[in-house]
């Protein structure tokens, strides 16, 4: 007789990632009877909300409801109606909202209040909106990738499927790059974590993990660019900024008020004799790299070793998954292949940045000019951050894996966040042997 599919006994969860540049909604699904197994939760949908990040709605909060509508309606379509009331919805806001809160707690609260009001009007089990800490963002990203790679289970489940999977239970480190912050999280080898703020202890599936994590606020790719511009305009002789991080022939007018809007540029703020200046691209990787390095203060370190700005960083250990903007930027530049050495990446960046703006636009006609113009900076910034910021070398570069998805689920903090809030990662190893994935009899 033919196998018949049993009625699906599944659960769903929704997490909204309210990032600095945009919001994404993720829908997760898992078999109800296997909640405590590692690796059974998977992403079934990602919906990118049209528009900027929620922190940009500070002067127009009444538009937040409309902004969220399309993706929330999409969730209503994807998740069966009978499941709506028991589907939890979580919204986590990251560094864009951390920065807004630094400027004004009242304005940040106002935005979050309207977000909560709006999301409460949907038929799901809304569990609240909050600004997650940088430490949480790093930790949940680390949990996500290791959960998806099967690192917490007794047998490595997707060993043959994931190309960068090594046949051992050593966890991957997590490198996350956003628009406003960047996180580095990994298990150091027999090294005491000298700074308590950077130490996390987890017990997952019966095993203890001592994890190092740090989130560098203002060192996401967008805020790093604002920092660099604010630093460079200080020494400009007039309102022309010849910038090596943009393609030759590129021109853009920047308002000084926009430059100093973010708390990230406060340290470079000065009274300028003009309200606007023009960026003129000169497209030189080496000079761009040098300019970026000036954002990292490496002259002061109160620990045995530091990343930059006096932040403790233990010696790098093992393989790392680099995701979010690390992946998107390197993917665009066609540099995510395991075979591309660090020297080759640098070579390609030199070539890419020196390409004229006209030629670049012709090569990528479908890419929005705003994004296209920033890939030279972003690619150079990634190299600078990984090599000089985090002390990767040409050798250890081979241990960085640029990851977009693992088994169809996006690498990022959202899955780890949901797994934690729904208590789906047990401290102890479940006693029962995990069932197979099949729902057929």
């Amino acid at each position: 007789t033919q196998n018949k599919a049993l009625p699906e006994n599944v659960k769903y969860g929704i997490v909204l990632d309210a990032g600095s540049s945009h919001t994404s909604l993720y829908i997760y699904k898992w078999p109800a009877e296997k909640e405590n197994d590692t690796g059974v939760v998977h992403q079934v949908e990602e919906c990118r909300v049209k528009g900027p990040g929620i922190s940009k709605f500070v002067q127009k909060v009444n538009e937040i409801g409309i902004y969220l509508t399309d993706c929330m309606e999409r969730a209503r379509e994807v998740i069966p109606r009978s499941q709506h009331q028991e589907t939890p919805v979580y919204l986590g806001a990251t560094a864009g909202m951390r920065l807004l809160r630094m400027e004004s707690e009242e304005l940040a609260d106002r935005v979050l209040d309207v977000v909560e009001r709006s999301l409460s009007n949907y038929p799901f089990d809304f569990q609240g909106a909050r600004i997650i800490t940088g430490q949480e963002e790093g930790a949940y990203g680390w949990i996500t990738i290791n959960y998806l790679l099967g690192k917490f289970s007794q047998k490595t489940r997707w060993f043959s499927i994931v190309p960068y999977e090594t046949n051992n239970q050593e966890t991957f480190g997590a490198l996350d790059l956003g628009g406003a912050s960047t996180q580095v999280t990994f298990v150091p080898q027999n090294q005491t974590i000298e700074s308590p703020d950077n130490a996390l202890q987890f017990r997952l599936y019966g095993k203890d993990y001592n994890v190092y994590t740090h989130s560098f606020l203002c060192y996401g790719k967008d805020q790093a660019l604002w920092q660099k511009l604010a630093k460079d305009i200080q020494v400009a002789s007039n309102e022309i900024l010849r910038d090596p991080c943009f393609h030759p022939g590129y021109k853009k007018v920047v308002n000084v008020s926009d430059l100093y809007k973010t708390p990230c540029t406060k340290r470079f703020e000065m009274t300028l004799p003009f309200q606007q200046f023009e960026i003129q691209g000169i497209g030189n990787y080496q000079q761009c790299h040098q300019s970026i390095l000036e954002l990292f203060n490496t002259s002061y370190c109160p620990y045995s070793q530091c990343a930059f700005n006096g932040i403790f960083l233990p010696p790098l250990q093992g393989d790392f998954g680099a995701f979010s903007a690390f992946y998107f930027v390197m993917k665009f530049l066609n540099l995510t292949s395991e075979k591309v050495s660090q020297e080759k990446v640098t070579e390609m960046m030199k070539k890419f940045c020196s390409k004229s703006w006209e030629e670049t636009k012709t090569s990528y006609p479908s890419v929005k000019e705003k994004y296209l113009s920033e890939y030279c900076f972003s690619g150079t910034y990634i190299l600078s951050l990984l090599l000089q910021g985090y002390h990767f070398t040409a050798d250890s570069w081979e241990h960085i894996h640029f990851i977009g998805k693992i088994q169809g689920s996006d690498a990022g903090w959202t899955l780890g966040y949901m797994l934690n809030l729904t208590n789906m990662i047990p401290a102890e190893q479940p006693l029962s042997t995990p069932l197979s994935h099949s729902t057929y009899v």
């Epitope: 909060v61 009444n62 937040i64 409801g65 009242e106 609260d109 106002r110 979050l112 209040d113 309207v114 909560e116 009001r117 709006s118 409460s120 809304f126 569990q127 609240g128 909050r130 600004i131």
Partner: antibody
Framework: QVQLVQSGAEVKKPGSSVKVSCKAS????????ISWVRQAPGQGLEWMGG??????NYAQKFQGRVTITADESTSTAYMELSSLRSEDTAVYYC???????????????WGQGTTVTVSS | GIVMTQSPDSLAVSLGERATINCKSS????????????LAWYQQKPGQPPKLLIY???TRASGVPDRFSGSGSGTDFTLTISSLQAEDVAVYYC?????????FGGGTKVEIK
């Protein structure tokens, strides 16, 4: 010191609508989240919905039957309840405060209440 | 939504004695970002609107006598009147303001024995 003053008592027929107003004085109205709470005779308190920063939301029970609006120019919030039935006979209160972000201190200021009687 | 369950329904206490009211929420109202419990207590006398007594589970609202105190965290909360006075005869409600929809407990009527 913020004060909330509500409109007077109303007697309504079943099937009709009622609109209750709540005028704020002594504070910046645009940053006041206003909740509406009702209390049937001899019963407890029941939250109906609220408005804050231009966005309203409602308890599931009243969804589709209640509309909460605010007019910043007059510092007044309104609660309109349609398709009235006898069970809607209650005292309707407006109060300052919402959830988490909009109501950090709970509902700290209350209107005097508006009695709505629904009877044929 | 979050269900608030109050006990007892009514309570008769002698003047000067302690009155204790319990409130349980169906899920935690403790907000991890600031470690505060989003729970309030109200007093309502006949013919009057409710009056805020306690917010953040344990902080007295301005002008509230110090015989009123709130305690508890997560899902279990208590309102205590350390020495009952005649003017304390009223109905007391707990309310969570952690998430929409806002929800109240069923109320506890406090009378003098």
């Amino acid at each position: 010191q913020v004060q909330l003053v509500q409109s007077g008592a109303e007697v309504k027929k079943p099937g009709s609508s009622v609109k209750v107003s709540c005028k704020a004085s002594g504070g910046t109205f645009s940053s006041l989240p206003i909740s509406w709470v009702r209390q049937a005779p001899g019963q407890g308190l029941e939250w109906m919905g609220g408005i804050g920063f231009g966005t309203a939301n409602y308890a599931q029970k009243f969804q589709g039957r209640v509309t909460i609006t605010a007019d910043e120019s007059t510092s007044t919030a309104y609660m309109e309840l349609s398709s009235l039935r006898s069970e809607d006979t209650a005292v309707y209160y407006c109060a300052r405060g919402g959830a988490k972000y909009a109501g950090r201190y709970g509902m700290d200021v209350w209107g005097q209440g508006t009695t709505v009687t629904v009877s044929s | 939504g979050i269900v608030m369950t109050q006990s007892p329904d009514s309570l008769a206490v002698s003047l000067g004695e302690r009155a204790t009211i319990n409130c349980k929420s169906s899920q935690s109202v403790l907000f991890s970002s600031n470690n505060k419990n989003y729970l309030a207590w109200y007093q309502q006398k006949p013919g009057q609107p409710p009056k805020l007594l306690i917010y953040w589970a344990s902080t007295r609202a301005s002008g509230v006598p110090d015989r009123f105190s709130g305690s508890g965290s997560g899902t279990d909360f208590t309102l205590t009147i350390s020495s009952l006075q005649a003017e304390d005869v009223a109905v007391y409600y707990c309310q969570q303001y952690y998430l929409y929809p806002l929800t109240f407990g069923g109320g506890t009527k406090v009378e003098i024995k």
